[in-house]
């Protein structure tokens, strides 16, 4: 038997993926566990194998269909169970009735690219991935820029309160290496959270022209 406190958290990416993390103090490392999804009104069900992400937590992704297919709606309730093998039987370790559109976390923005760079400014664009058509253009973004000698945690957050898939960074230092990240969040859902940060985009501002004021 496995004792200790257990936490089972899942998010829906708004299209065809439910990602889950299960943590259990005192859990057995060599136990085989999985997440099972059973919707209340759909003909499919789905399973994924929990894989370790740290000493006492496991994660997996329930792939519900093609990446851009709309597999769930606001009225769906999905019973999610953590099942662990005990000998020849499966034991239910955790269970929740999951409301997908109350627990949203979109995929991280992708395809970050520098559109135009100058000495003091840089225009960057990105794309969102696998976001439901239900949101239309009603999404918000947060962005941050890593300056030399600083950490990501120290970087001020820039908020974009609309679906604007570009930003113009200003007051940059010439001939300097920077990194940029962005994340996205829908407006809907009581327990909705920010997407993971995008992969960082590295860029360098242009050097100041010699003999000119900058």
């Amino acid at each position: 038997a496995v004792n200790g406190t257990s936490q089972f958290t899942c998010f829906y990416n708004s299209r065809a993926n439910i990602s889950c993390v299960w943590s259990q103090d005192g859990a057995l490392q060599d136990t085989s566990c999985q997440v099972h999804a059973w919707p209340d009104r759909r003909r499919w069900n789905q399973t994924c194998e929990l894989l370790p992400v740290s000493q006492a937590s496991w994660a997996c992704n329930l792939i519900l269909g093609a990446p851009d297919s709309q597999k769930l709606t606001t009225v769906d309730i999905v019973t999610l169970r953590v099942l662990c093998r005990e000998g020849v039987r499966w034991r239910v370790m955790a269970i929740q009735d999951f409301k997908p559109f109350e627990n949203l976390r979109l995929m991280a923005p992708i395809s970050l690219q520098v559109v135009h760079v100058e000495t003091h400014r840089c225009n960057i664009s990105w794309e969102i991935s696998q976001a439901s058509h239900y949101f239309e253009r009603h999404l918000e973004f947060e962005a941050r820029t890593l300056s030399p000698g600083h950490t990501w945690e120290e970087a001020p957050l820039l908020t974009l309160k609309q679906k604007q898939e570009w930003i113009c960074l200003e007051t940059l230092t010439p001939d300097t290496q920077y990194e940029f990240q962005v994340r996205v969040k829908p407006l809907q859902g009581e327990f909705t959270t920010w997407s993971p940060w995008s992969q960082p985009l590295a860029f360098r501002t242009k050097p100041a022209a010699l003999g000119k004021d900058t």
Partner: nanobody, 119 residues
């Protein structure tokens, strides 16, 4: 102004049929579910049938095999085909639509249409 307009209610004999319809019109929206609920005096409003995106229909046990729901997502209209009607099907039938407006989801209700099944 957003509106849900119901029609098709009326008085019918036991064993007869009726077809209810409900159309949503008005401001910009996307519907992800539409359905029918009924209310009888002194009781809570209860689900009769609904249909969500992806074609998943849900029916109350008491109407399975007798009622059929059809949703036209292009016209934003939902129909309820009721056959083999019984006196216990009598009540006010309300249309409900789950609508996405400006990135948020809300439920909207029609005014209701009376269905009376006489024995």
């Amino acid at each position: 102004q957003l509106q849900l307009v119901e029609s098709g209610g009326g008085l019918v004999q036991t064993g007869g049929s009726l077809r209810l319809s409900c159309a949503v019109s008005g401001s910009r929206f996307i519907s992800d579910v539409m359905g029918w609920y009924r209310q009888v005096p002194g009781k809570q409003r209860e689900l009769v049938a609904d249909m969500a995106d992806g074609g998943s229909a849900k029916y109350a046990d008491s109407v399975k095999g007798r009622f059929s729901i059809l949703r036209d997502s292009v016209k934003n209209t939902v129909y309820l085909q009721m056959s083999s009607l019984k006196p216990e099907d009598t009540g006010i039938y309300y249309c409900k639509a789950g609508l996405w407006i400006a990135g948020r989801h809300s439920d909207y209700w029609g005014q209701g249409t009376q269905v009376t099944v006489s024995s």
